[in-house]
């Protein structure tokens, strides 16, 4: 028995080939016997019922001459999985046709985080296995619905997944799109009195959905709201702001949001929710402050806000070697020279930040 | 542990409409293909419908096309038999049944491993 | 649809005894065969499968063998919970059918 794998929706060909290479006399049937299609001498195909029950059936009449006469079933349905028998030269063979179809769980739009199941819709009698293929190469293998947790952006795009069966295969390409925020974490490094402004883009834009961006800065002990804001057709609206910050939304796409002048005591991290239909996505915000000062005869450079255990404050005179370089959030120069000093917030060879202040002579308080 | 329940039998008569379901417990049930069972009473057994773990793909036997519809609620861990213009010849334990898988050498191998205790259908004047 | 005819209909064998029990298939079914056990007021229960394997749990003394369209399940050495009724079942293709059964009885 031949066997012929299709796809759902799609066209197969059922082979059958007579030895003489030349056009004779041949009949499609069901297996129960029912007659599908065939060519009584005439080179004229004859239907076995009528059109609208067979008009997805055809054969090639082109293939005739070369005692090729196969069936071909358009828009393939899962019920068309059945043995079919294609009669001539008095001999009988059978083409089992098994077709498969591979689905997304409930939908093909997911968010970041959340699990993917990709079941395979098969014929009763089939033993397949699959295999699929991520957009970032990862493969995974099973029966007949296989899952993957936690999905990352990366998981954007084209999965293939492969269907096997009696060594025969069969391909499927499914796009699945992961929604979430482009990067997991931003970081703003900012002198006191700068402005701070944070994108949050996305990688999709027809969702409508709210959100919130929930602070809590170093010397706090608890996640206060700072903003509150609605998105409805790719415009950006607030719904709740804290006074004192501010703040301000950008009324477009993607989120923006700016603090027009920082200070020490804003220094510390966030979390923005975008609730969805689908659920909730998550960003991380950070925000390090640096303020240099000069406080009678002395010049302090600090930093307040998530920084690594291995980032170093540096306080030096410009073109001069760093007078104090420690991996501590508060650094002091009692006695500064008159002149421009820099300070530096570094991690390893990168600065990740710097602030400078003209001390013009010692004992005069500045900021 | 893994268990599947069937409910929803009993006495109607010809012509009459009847809704079974199987409740499942002990394991992801929308991982898995299901399947109705029946047998007649004193008799052998007869596959009845089979439906895909998404319920996109349905099978029914010869002698129940059009009148029974199997379907199934992933969300409840449920599937279901609804049974309309039922005949005497429909009189039987109904069966409802996982379809399992075993892998070997990355080879699939399919087969009924969980069944239910099943519900009794009489269908009588 | 395919046809499983099961043999003997009925067969009595004393405890401890070797059991054989046939089905054929009227046309092949490849290895996409089962066999079941059912008591009286009891859902079948998965023996076989894939003609030789056994299910979980399952004795080593029930075996299955064959393919194509002739299959036997032996019981090497009967134990009295082994008597009741056996059905083969083919799932090679749509419709899926079992044999009318084999009653195993105690002699």
């Known amino acids: 028995k031949t066997l012929v794998l299709g796809k759902e929706g799609e066209s197969a060909e059922l082979p059958c080939e007579s030895s003489q290479k030349k056009i004779t006399v041949f009949t499609w049937k069901f297996s129960d016997q029912r007659k599908i299609l065939g060519q009584h001498g005439k080179g004229v195909l004859i239907r076995g019922g009528s059109p609208s029950q067979f008009d997805r059936f055809d054969s090639k009449k082109g293939a005739w001459e070369k005692g090729s006469f196969p069936l071909i079933i358009n828009k393939l349905k899962m019920e068309d999985s059945q043995t079919y028998i294609c009669e001539l030269e008095n001999r009988k063979e059978e083409v089992e046709l098994w077709v498969f179809k591979v689905t997304a769980n409930s939908d093909t739009h997911l968010l970041q985080g959340q699990s993917l199941t990709l079941t395979l819709e098969s014929p009763p009698g089939s033993s397949p296995s699959v295999q699929c293929r991520s957009p970032r190469g990862k493969n995974i293998q099973g029966g007949k619905t296989l899952s993957v947790s936690q999905l990352e952006l990366q998981d954007s795009g084209t999965w293939t997944c492969t269907v096997l069966q009696n060594q025969k295969k069969v391909e499927f390409k499914i796009d699945i799109v992961v929604l979430a925020f482009q990067s997991t974490a931003i970081t703003a490094y900012k002198s006191e009195g700068e402005s701070a402004e944070f994108s949050f883009p996305l990688n999709f834009a027809e969702e409508n959905g709210w959100g919130e961006l929930m602070w809590k800065a170093e010397k706090d002990s608890f996640f206060q709201p700072w903003i509150s804001f609605s998105i409805k057709n790719k415009e950006v609206s607030v719904q709740k702001s804290t006074k004192d910050l501010k703040l301000q939304l950008k009324e477009t796409l993607p989120l923006t949001l700016k603090i027009p002048q920082v200070s020490l005591q804003f220094a510390g991290s966030g979390n923005l929710t975008l609730t969805l239909d689908k659920g909730t996505l998550h960003q991380e915000v950070n925000l390090v402050v640096m303020k240099v000062a000069q406080l009678n005869n002395t010049l302090t450079c600090e930093v307040m806000g998530p920084t690594s255990p291995k980032m170093r404050l540096t306080l030096k005179q410009e073109n001069q070697e760093a007078r104090v370089s420690e991996e501590q959030k508060v650094v002091q120069v009692v006695a500064p020279e008159t002149g421009l000093w820099q300070c530096l917030l570094s991690e390893g060879d990168k600065v990740k930040m710097d602030s400078r202040i003209q001390v013009l002579s010692r004992g005069v308080n500045q900021t | 542990q893994v268990q599947l329940v069937e409910s929803g039998g009993g006495l109607v008569k010809p012509g009459g409409s009847l809704r079974l379901s199987c409740s499942a417990s002990g394991f992801t049930f929308s991982d898995y293909y299901m399947n109705w069972i029946r047998q007649a009473p004193g008799k052998g057994l007869e596959w009845v419908s089979y439906?895909?773990?998404?319920?996109?793909?349905?099978f029914y036997t010869d002698s129940v096309k059009g009148r029974f519809t199997i379907s199934r609620d992933n969300a409840k861990n449920s599937l279901y038999l609804q049974m309309n213009s039922l005949r005497a010849e429909d009189t039987a334990v109904y069966y409802c049944?996982?379809?399992?898988?075993?892998?070997?050498?990355?080879?699939?191998?399919?087969?009924?491993?969980?069944w239910g205790k099943g519900t009794t259908v009489t269908v009588s004047s | 649809e395919i046809v499983m005819t099961q043999s003997p209909a009925a067969l009595s064998v004393s405890p401890g005894e070797r059991a054989t029990l046939s089905c054929r298939a009227s046309q092949s079914v490849s290895n996409k065969f089962a066999w079941y056990q059912q008591k009286p007021g009891q859902a079948p229960r998965l023996l076989i499968y894939n003609a030789s394997t056994r299910a979980t749990s399952i004795p080593a003394r029930f075996s299955g063998s064959g393919s194509g369209t002739e299959f036997t399940l032996t019981i090497s050495s009967l134990q009295s919970e082994d008597f009741a009724v056996y059905y083969c079942q083919h799932y090679n293709n749509w419709p899926y059918t079992f044999g009318q059964g084999t009653k195993l009885e105690i002699k």
């Open positions: 439906i895909s773990s998404s319920g996109i793909t349905i």
């Open positions: 049944a996982r379809e399992d898988y075993s892998n070997y050498e990355d080879h699939y191998y399919y087969y009924t491993g969980v």
